[in-house]
Every structure is written in C-alpha cells, then in structure tokens.
Interface confidence: low
C-alpha cells in the first residue's frame, strides 16, 4: 500500500517522466504501477493503445489524435512520437533490417550527444540455441548478430534464475556478493522472505552492490530507468525509450534498458523445443525491429550501442521427472525446501537444536542408483559456482540433474486434472549446462564489426557497459579488460598487479644431521656418496625456470615468506609459513613416460637441505594422525630419471592429503596428466593448495587459517588446484607455442571421503575424471583463492591473458 500517495494529481505532460516523484505526489514513471503510486489518469494518458503500434498506408498524414498509441501525422517526426514504421510506410524508407550491414567506424550522432547512448535489450529465458532459428524467425536479431559482435553463448551465474542474473548483469557481482541469491530467499537476520511476487522485493535492504544506473548517476551520467512494470506493453517501452532519446541534451539519459518477459513465459509453458516457441521469438524480433526502425527514424541507428542479452537459458523439464525428498528422509515436514531445478534446505523452525544438516546430507547422499540430484553442504559446492558466502544461502544445497526437479513430497507437485504437467520447461540448473547458456550480441559504433568472440560470463558485462559509457566501474567480480576484444576502441587498459612478496632463493645448505623428519629415506640411498650428489643437484638452477615456468613465475600478492626451489623436473614456490609449496610447476612432454616408484620410496620422504628444519614438515604429525596422509605436488611417476625421482620425495614437495583424496590426486597425476600431455602435444601443470575455510572464495590469511586449524602444526588445505596449459594449436608443443594458449583448471575439494562420487568404490577410471570435470574452474577463481597471479611473462597482450584467465572449460557438448 502507498497511503502517502495523493493519486488525484495528473500525468498530463508527465508520462514516463525520468524523475520519480516523491511522496505525497503521485507518480507517472514507468514503475509507478509496481508501487501502486501512479496518478489516477496514468493508464488513460500513458498507456494508450488506440490504433495500435504501427502506421498503415491509410493512416499516413492522419489528423493528430492524442488518443492514439503512436502517430502517423505529418508533425510526428518533429514531435518525436511517430510509430516506428512511419518513415517506411509513409515516406518510402527501407526497414533497418533490409539495409545491408555497414561498418560504423565512428559514432554518427546528432549534435549535442556527448557519448553514444547505450540501450540494453534484455530478454528473459533466451536459450543460446534459439539463435539457430536464424533470419526466418528472427531477421532483426540475426542482423544484429551477424553485423555486430556476438558470442556463441554467454554463461549466466548460478542459480540460473532471473533475478540473480539480471542483478548480476547490472552489478558485475555474483549472487553471493550482491545478495539476490534466488528468485525467492529467506534472510535469517531480517527474518523475512523475498519473493518475485510480493512487496518485500521493493525493500532496498535486499539489494547489495552498485548497479550500473547508480554508477552512472554518481559520475554525472544520466540513466533511464532499468525496470518496467509488467503491465506496460513492450511496444510502449520501446516508444518511451525512443522519446527519451529525443529529450534536450541536459535531460537525455545515456543508458536505457528494455526487458522482455518472453521467451521465458512460453519456454516454461511449452519447453524449449516446442514448436510454439517460434511465435514468441518472432514477437521479440518484431520489437527489436521496432527499436531499430525507430532509431533509424531518429537518425540514431549509427550512433547508439545496443546490447542484446539474455538472463539464462531454458531446459526441457516436466513434473513427471521429479525427485521427492520424502523418498529419502522421514521428516520432510520439518524442513523447508526451495524446490525446483535446485534445492535449498533449511529447518522449518528457527533455532531448531535438533536440525542437523550433516545428518540430512548423509540421508540424501548416494541412496539410489538412479538418483537425479546431489546434496552438498554449501561450502563443498564447486567453487566455480561462487554460491556459499551469504547468509541467505541455506547450508544444504541440492544440485539437480538437468531436466529434473526436486520437491519435498508428491503433495507439493501439481498436475492438471488430466494428469498432464503445467509446464514443459524450466531453468536454474548448474550454469555450465549448455541448456542454461544464453545470448549476447553487441551492435553499434563501439562494438567490432562482424566479429565472433569466445563465450564469456555475464559478470564481465558490467565493466564493458561502464567502458561504453566512460564510467569507472565500482568494485565487482568481473575482470576488467578481459572483454576488450569485443570493442573497437578500448578506453580501459588493464595493468598487471604488483608483486607484493619477492621470493627468497635459498643459499644455505642445512646439515643432514639437523633433520629428524621421522620418515627419512636417506638411509635407503646406495652408495652413500650418492646422497651428496643428490643434495648438490638441489642447488644447480640449470634451465629449469625456462622449462617449467613457461609463463613466468607466479606473483604472490600478499606479505609472506617463501623460497624458490629448483629441481630437474619441477620448480616450487615453497611457503615457510604453511610449510608446503604455494605452487609447483612442471612441463610434461607428449613423449613423457609414466614410471613406477621403487618400493623403498613409497613410505618415506627426504629432507630438503635448502630449507631450515624449522620450516619443514615432520612426518611424525602424520604418523600420529591416522586420518591424514600426505601426497606430492610434483608426481614421482613423471620423474625423468631415477636420480630425479629422489627430488620428488623431498619433504618440500609434500602436502597433507586425506587418504580418500589421494585416490583422486594419484589418478590425476598418474593417468590424466599423461593423457592430457599426449592429446595436447605436451602440457604445463601448476598445482598447489587452497585455504578457504570461511568459503568466501578468497585467500584466507594466516590468522584466519589459525582459527580453523588450531593445534595442528600443518594447516590442512580445503582444496587443491591445478592449472593445465597447452598450445591451442596442438601441432605446436606446449613449450614452443607462439599462438594462443589453451587452459583447463580444476579446484578439487580436499575431503576425507569420496562420497560426492557415488561409484567411488569402483576403479578410479570410472569416476575421478567426472569429479574433476564437476570441479572445473577459471584461472581467475584460483587466483582469488590463492592471492597468486599467473601468466605474467608471455608474448601475448595482457587483455588476451585476462581472457584466458576468465575462460571456463565446461566439458559440455556444443551449443
């Protein structure tokens, strides 16, 4: 309710005013309907529909009738209120879509335009594959795509729902950062629930971050309103934007947004493959045509930049494919489930002492051979999802298999009396699933002409939009500069972050007798004088830097102490604080052989005479803790010689690993690294530990780690990462690549069990690779989690490296 609004005021001359009138005055802006604060005559004056949205031959030169939705009178151009096809029908002009593609090398704007305006045309539920329908169904959109810059698809954020994604587009933030973590969500501090329908969504307290329209306003750039009340017809939205574009210079906004509820509405109803989808797509295209014809009519079609963008895709889902938690849990009435294409579970009762998320997870884990969802504590979700660090995200999360739904119990799912489902499509699944991918097209003077770019994530668009408007972006999750290749000219030139801690290159050799590791192998070395040789090897730098650090030394972006340790087959940045490497890098050629490890080396390690005993791990800690074992960052199996193998067993190559996780890590090192090297003509691998106990996606400080691992001398990583780089052109070996690079990265959860993989009792070949693909990640994710900066020394431009760092290898089939 809006008790303060005096609706007796009038919208005469105020329709779609850009300044929102404050109480007690009634409003005439495009959101007044949502807030129920419009003046009494808003519908009558501002939502006129008489005679439709188009000129017909018989309307040309009509006597102006103010009741008409738009005009075809001789004065309409001067008045800025023509129907968008006025010049086509009445003056013999061509439709924009019928004109040839033309390269707009520089914006051709009327006098008074300080910068090319930006129009963001957002469409709900536009699955990337809809673009395949082409110009027969969507001639206008197809022209934008082929004449402008497009990607095969754009990745939404998880969950692939409307509100989280629209607000991510506006802020460049992940939902965990901006707060809109779902279309519906409960905030335990507010003790309130946010729903798509309902008034709570109008409360500013839910919306974090800085959206583009605020960034613009703060920097003196006018923004048209980004939201439209659902009752305002699409045609009226377009005509309004066109009218705003004719405002005097000092009133005219520089950025505008259009939003269409289609094709999402139809996608839900008919499913993404329903033949009925053609009509809504035609309708959207018609609106795009009206926009472009309208811009041409205003002589702005070679001035403005247009972004055509979706929020998420659409999957074929019906209620017959529903998993019921009542088949797994006895107490579903004690929980609240946010149901559907993902599941979020919380206790129905606040402060319920009996509520045990771990017990619920146990009852939901691997219980059926054909289970269509996987339960996670939110901190164990794949890090690429960035879906944990917010109190509105419940502790228990269910990742649902594509094409399926999850519900509490059968009573919670409804069908028509005929038994048919009420929907055929839905979205919300894992954001790497190809049906969830959506569309991106950029068209106009600032975008490149006829250019196809690789897929990217929607968190990156906020920075691009700021660039288009000459704004300095607020802090966000995008990587500024990573999309420079979309733009004809770049106002922003990214620079490499400064290295904060330079490494130490150890010059001291500690006496062998100083070490008591509790597990040394050195007594197994024959002959005895070989030991000195092995230790001397540790001090000869040789050419390992060039061979194993193909892209320069990773930079450490926080204050710490670490040593560079050279070896024949690998190189490490060894932390004196964590007593393990921050990173270990090695290059594996296509021809590399996997060798076995001698029995006498399998259960012992060697002291590293370059590192003080007080900065070395001690095996006694592992002997006393049966739950913990250790593994190696450089795989002993890939040693180039028997002598080099001893380097792999140095205590400085050792990291704490749960026995269950070692199965994953060993299979990765023994089988998959070799497989990748064979397939890709050699690979460079950088691996290391991650500490993210507070699951905020950022590197934990030493103090933070101490809070979580009290009483342990060796901090246990929460994850291990691996970055695998090769030449994009597999005909070139990884270490002699002069073209673009190809990267795939993983952030593997370091857990004491393998219950995430239901078939982990089987041979590793049956499940490890699937697990790794699930935990695929961007290099950028790893950089945030480690405070390291990779790829600092290459022949490629820095924006190209940023594009590489923001790439996610999805292991999905083509869109």
């Amino acid at each position: 309710d809006s008790p303060w609004t005096n609706i007796s005021g009038s919208c005469k001359g105020r329709c779609f005013e850009l300044q929102e009138a404050g109480p007690p005055d009634c409003r005439c802006d495009n959101l007044c309907k949502s807030y129920t604060s419009c003046c009494h005559d808003f519908d009558e004056l501002c939502l006129k529909t008489a005679r439709g949205w188009e000129c017909t031959k018989d309307r040309c030169g009509e006597v102006r009738n103010e009741e008409n939705a738009c005009h075809c009178s001789e004065d309409c151009l001067a008045r800025g209120d023509c129907c968008t096809n006025y010049q086509v029908v009445c003056k013999g002009e061509s439709h924009w879509v019928d004109d040839d593609c033309e390269e707009i090398k520089a914006a051709e704007c009327p006098a008074g335009f300080v910068r090319p305006p930006l129009i963001i045309f957002s469409v709900d539920g536009f699955r990337a594959s809809y673009m395949k329908k082409g110009s027969k169904v969507m001639p206008n959109i197809e022209k934008l795509r082929s004449c402008g810059t497009h990607s095969p698809y754009m990745r939404p954020v998880y969950p692939t729902k409307t509100f989280p994604n629209l607000y991510t587009l506006a802020t460049g933030l992940y939902p965990e950062s901006h707060g809109i973590v779902g279309n519906s969500m409960y905030d335990p501090v507010f003790d309130a629930t946010f729903h798509l329908r309902g008034r709570e969504k109008f409360n500013h307290r839910w919306w974090g971050g800085q959206p583009l329209w605020i960034t613009a306003t703060k920097q003196g750039v006018k923004a048209g309103t980004f939201f439209w009340s659902v009752v305002i017809p699409h045609e009226r939205r377009i005509l309004t934007i066109l009218q705003w574009l004719t405002l005097p210079d000092h009133e005219r906004p520089s950025v505008y947004a259009f939003y269409s509820e289609q094709p999402d509405f139809s996608g839900h109803k008919y499913g993404p493959f329903g033949p009925e989808m053609t009509n809504p797509l035609r309708e959207i295209d018609k609106i795009v045509g009206q926009l472009m014809d309208g811009l041409k009519q205003l002589k702005l079609h070679r001035c403005v930049n247009v972004i055509f963008v979706g929020d998420h895709g659409m999957e074929d889902v019906t209620c017959d494919r529903t998993e019921f938690l009542s088949n797994y849990l006895t107490n579903v009435d004690d929980i609240t489930l946010v149901p559907g294409t993902l599941g979020r579970i919380r206790s129905k009762f606040s402060n319920n002492a009996k509520y045990d998320p771990k017990a619920i997870i146990a009852n939901l884990t691997c219980k059926k051979p054909d289970q269509h969802f996987k339960p996670y504590l939110k901190q164990h979700l794949p890090k690429r999802l960035h879906y944990a660090n917010n109190r509105r995200i419940e502790d228990i999360h269910l990742l649902v298999e594509r094409r399926w739904h999850v519900a509490r119990k059968p009573l919670d799912v409804y069908k028509k009396p005929s038994g048919k489902c009420f929907f055929q499509g839905d979205h919300g699944f894992d954001n790497k699933v190809n049906s969830m991918q959506t569309v991106f097209v950029g068209y106009g003077s600032t975008f490149k002409y006829k250019t196809k770019v690789p897929p990217f994530e929607n968190i990156e668009l906020y920075n691009v939009m700021c660039d288009l408007l000459g704004l300095k972006p607020a802090p966000n999750n995008g990587t500024h500069g990573s999309l420079n290749h979309l733009l004809r000219t770049n106002t922003f030139r990214p620079t490499m972050p400064e290295e904060v801690t330079r490494p130490n290159y150890p010059g001291i050799m500690y006496l062998q007798s100083d070490f008591d590791l509790g597990c040394t192998c050195d007594d197994k070395v024959e002959p005895k004088n070989k030991l000195d040789e092995l230790n001397k090897r540790l001090h000869t730098k040789g050419s390992t830097e060039e061979r194993h650090l193909l892209y320069g030394r990773p930079a450490v972006l926080y204050r710490t102490r670490y040593d560079i340790l050279y070896h024949t087959d690998f190189e490490s940045g060894y932390s004196e604080i964590f007593l393990m490497p921050l990173w270990t890098s090695y290059t594996v050629s296509k021809q590399a052989e996997v060798s076995s490890v001698p029995d006498h080396l399998t259960s012992c390690v060697r002291p590293d005479v370059r590192v003080s005993p007080s900065f070395s791990q001690n095996c006694l800690a592992y002997k006393n803790d049966k739950q913990m074992s250790y593994g190696f960052l450089f795989p002993p199996y890939l040693s180039s010689s028997p002598e080099a193998k001893y380097d792999a067993f140095l205590v400085t190559n050792m990291v704490p690993m749960y026995p269950a996780f070692k199965r994953v890590w060993n299979y990765f090192q023994r089988v998959l690294v070799k497989k990748y090297a064979s397939e890709r003509n050699g690979v460079n691998v950088i691996s290391g530990p991650i500490f993210d106990y507070d699951y905020d996606g950022l590197h934990d400080t030493e103090d933070k780690i101490k809070q979580y691992v009290e009483g342990s001398s060796i901090p246990v990583p929460t994850h291990y990462y691996s970055i695998i780089t090769s030449c994009l052109d597999f005909t070139q070996p990884a270490d002699k690549c002069d073209g673009p690079l190809s990267v795939s990265s993983f952030i593997l959860p370091h857990r004491p069990d393998n219950e995430e993989s239901c078939n982990s009792s089987e041979d590793e070949s049956k499940w490890v690779e699937e697990l790794m693909k699930m935990h695929t990640a961007r290099v950028r994710d790893i950089e945030h989690l480690t405070s390291l900066d990779f790829f600092r020394k290459t022949s490629r431009s820095y924006p190209e490296i940023l594009t590489l760092k923001t790439y996610l290898h999805t292991y999905e089939s083509e869109i």
Epitope: S2, R197, G198, F265, T336, L411, D412, V413, K415, G419
Partner: antibody, heavy 123, light 107 residues
Amino acid sequence: QVQLVQSGAEVKKPGSSVKVSCKASGGTFSSYAISWVRQAPGQGLEWMGGIIPIFGTANYAQKFQGRVTITADESTSTAYMELSSLRSEDTAVYYCARIARYARGYMHTFDYWGQGTLVTVSS
Amino acid sequence: DIQMTQSPSSLSASVGDRVTITCRASQSISSYLNWYQQKPGKAPKLLIYAASSLQSGVPSRFSGSGSGTDFTLTISSLQPEDFATYYCQQHLSIPITFGQGTKVEIK
C-alpha cells in the same frame, strides 16, 4: 470428477479444539493442494491457510497463526484443519478448497470446494 | 495485506438485465483475480479465473475484465439461477483475500 467430502457438523465449547477433515476423490491426491476458507453466518469468505507447495510448507493467515494446523494424509487422501482455543466468533462454516495449478506455478484459484462443515462454538 | 473492495454491496435487477459488479484492489495485482458465485447454503463456485478466463462449464454470459487494480464481472443477460452473492478474490500474495461480496437480488 474431483470431489471433496468434508466431515459433519460439530458443536464445541469455547477453549476447545476442532479438527475438520476433507477427503478427496477423483484424481491423485498427491497432486492436490488444499486451502481452508471459512464463512461466519451472514458474512463473507475468509482464507485461513493451506498446504502450498511453492513455499514447501503449510501457510497460514496471520490472524490464525498459532491456532490453526493444516495437515494431509496421503494414505487416506484426506486433508485436515485443526483450530484450537475456540471462541464464539469462530462459529462458521469451514470449507476446504482445492488450489489449482497453472503453467507458471501454483495459483490460489479454488476450482473445487467441499460442501462445508458448520462448527458452532457455544458454552 | 491486499484489501479487496467490491461495489455495490448489493443490487436489485430483473431477468434479462445486464449486470456489472466491480472490484478494486488496494495495490496492483496484475491479473491475479478470480470471481466466485455463492448461493445460500452452498459452497462457492469458481466462475472466472485470471481476471478474464471463463472456468469450464460456466455459461458464456459471465465475463471478466480488468488488470492492475480495477476489475469487473459482467453478466450480460441475468437469468433466474444467477441470483446469488458474488465474491472477487486476489491471489497475488499471501494472505489470500476476498472482497466483501455483492448480493444480486430480484427486483
């Protein structure tokens, strides 16, 4: 054909509780959602609450919160509404009604109604 | 809560008359509005859902219109069996609320 058959009339003392049942037939009960609506003598309709899937739980009007409990027993295709701490102003006809579901989700459109149960609260 | 206000509270009409009942919501409810008919001693019956869609089995003389805050139920030609009380109901948000009812009586 969907039918909702409610339990018979009840006379209750103030402070006591009443439990009204609503048995469904025709169609699968597991695909039903049920709301309860009451009507005091000579008055209009008043929504009390219902089992609403989109919220994953029973939902109640603020006015009845703490006094009303709505449950369902799939094995007998029966929904129940229990109202406690009865007072004279609770005298009304209590209806169960099926919540319809459409393409975009669960809409509180009541397409089938029970015959009603008169509950009289009198000392 | 969203308040629903019907007008008039009652009206007298003759068989064959065109009858219009209006319902106003205290805030915009888009098209989330239903109309019900109730005869004495009987349960309500759904006539119109989503503001303007006719429920199957309901005679075509009943029609609904409106969107946002103002809605109308029209009976194009009143029949003897149409004398009853009519209720509007919003289902945009919980709690669900009904109008106070409009009683259509014989003149």
